[in-house]
């Protein structure tokens, strides 16, 4: 937890953030609260970014005052103006780009004191695996995709069975650079696969982790797929 | 230049499919927001669809369902898929980017008419 | 869901005039996420504000934004005969996505 220190003889507030990942090409939210107001209009947040000169944002007196906003983030941010009252001054953030990446300020004034939080904030792309039976190969395959990863990550493949084999000699993973030229569409593909058997595809790096399983019976094929954020530290 | 050019409205019976393509060209489609917006005749404007970026998508409530938006990178072309059409479907269709500033590039427009 | 009202419905004023337009959203919306379109008959529309103030590409200064929460506002210091249009505002970031208001014409007197 980072508090705020008291100025003028005000007092210091608490005000917390948590680190989090933006994935590029969608809407981000930078988090933060604080102790609230029993005033809108006495409450002060200024959204800042370290090597920017201008303000991410401003919220004063109970409106966005914008006549400061860096030019980078013109048309692109807004806080959560129904939820100021409560202690909530995060920040979203329009169509995040991977220059958006870096360390963030969160700096709150109510009538009780001033606080602020540094907030480090991590941009990337992920995406969801499926994982499908490759009735193209020669032999039992599985092929696992995901659309958009950036920075490259790992791919390791798992099954319920033989629990803590490695794949690595049976498996091959590729990248192929996105047309935006820079994400990347994961493909790995499993070969020699047993039915009976659940198999996962787990792809990682420093910004998500996500994970396909498919269940192959002879009966029937079950899909499962999940991604979790990596580095959500509280401050 | 920067340019959207939209193409494949016409006349079409209620119930029918119709695909409309809208081709950019001065920027990367993948790395904008885009939209579809529509105008009935002497209407005003209305949102129909979005991808972004990321390639997620979203919905007018009044197209959820029947209408898919969709792009291919490699054309550099966005499109709507629409299904289950009705009569009140019936407008001009414009494609249009939504970059950090407001939708700033928008297309000519298409016209789209559902009637038996 | 985010309704925009715009009024007047129709504003008739001569060339040279001030055009004083209203967009009141039903709940506040960022100023960051609303913008104005100008469009005129047979025409795709066009931006004119973006981030409530901010004066989109190429567009006179004679055309600007202001406004915050609830009550926005697009101003046109002198008309000219190229001004007359119909005018939208329009909102991003709420459900549904993407909301116009009605519009409002301005029509020459």
């Known amino acids: 937890l980072i508090i705020g220190f008291g100025i003028s003889g005000r007092h210091s507030i608490t005000v917390t953030t948590v680190a989090s990942a933006g994935n590029i090409g969608e809407d981000g939210i930078l988090s933060c609260t604080f102790e609230p107001d029993i005033k809108l209009s006495d409450i002060v947040i200024q959204w800042l970014k370290e090597g920017v000169l201008g303000l991410v944002h401003e919220f004063k007196e109970g409106k966005d005052e914008l006549s400061e906003q860096d030019e980078m983030f013109r048309g692109r941010t807004a806080v959560f103006a129904d939820q100021v009252i409560v202690g909530n001054a995060s920040l979203r953030l329009k169509n995040v780009q991977l220059t958006d990446a870096g360390t963030y300020k969160c700096y709150i004034i109510t009538s009780k004191g001033k606080g602020n939080a540094n907030l480090e904030y991590k941009t990337g792309a992920f995406s969801m695996p499926e994982v499908n039976v490759d009735y193209n190969a020669s032999s039992e395959t599985l092929r696992c995709e995901a659309p958009r990863w950036f920075p490259q990550p790992t791919v390791v493949w798992a099954s319920q069975v033989d629990q803590g084999a490695n794949f690595s000699e049976v498996s091959n993973t590729s990248f192929e650079l996105n047309s935006e030229n820079v994400t990347m569409k994961v493909v790995s593909v499993l070969y020699n696969v047993t039915i009976n058997n659940t198999y996962s595809c787990m792809i990682e790096n420093d910004i998500a982790k996500a994970t396909g399983d498919i269940k192959v019976t002879e009966s029937e094929i079950k899909r499962r797929s999940h991604l979790q954020l990596l580095n959500s530290k509280a401050s | 230049e920067v340019q959207l050019v939209e193409s494949g409205g016409g006349l079409i019976q209620p119930g029918g499919s119709l695909r409309l393509s809208c081709a950019a060209s001065g920027f990367i489609v993948s790395r904008n927001y885009m939209n579809w917006v529509r105008q009935a005749p002497g209407k005003g404007l209305e949102w129909v669809s979005v991808?972004?970026?990321?390639?997620?998508?979203d919905y007018a409530d009044s197209v959820k369902g029947r209408f898919t938006i969709s792009r291919d990178n490699s054309k550099n072309t966005l499109y709507l898929q629409m299904n289950s059409l009705r009569a009140e479907d019936t407008a001009v269709y414009y494609c249009?980017?939504?970059?950090?500033?407001?939708?700033?590039?928008w297309g000519q427009g298409t016209t789209v008419t559902v009637s038996s | 869901e985010i309704v925009l009202t715009q009024s007047p419905g129709t504003l008739s004023l001569s060339p040279g005039e001030r055009a004083t337009l209203s967009c009141r959203a039903s709940?506040?919306?960022?100023?960051?996420?609303l913008a104005w379109y100008q469009q005129k008959p047979g025409q795709a529309p066009r931006l004119l504000i973006y981030g409530a103030s901010s004066r989109a590409t190429g567009i006179p200064d004679r055309f600007s934004g202001s406004g915050s929460g609830t009550d926005f506002t697009l101003t046109i210091s002198r008309l000219e005969p190229e001004d007359f249009a119909v005018y939208y505002c329009q909102q991003y970031g709420s459900s549904p996505l993407y909301t116009f208001g009605q519009g409002t014409k301005l029509e020459i007197k």
């Open positions: 709940q506040s919306v960022s100023s960051s996420y």
């Open positions: 249009a980017r939504d970059g950090d500033y407001g939708m700033d590039v």
């Open positions: 991808i972004y970026g990321s390639g997620r998508t």
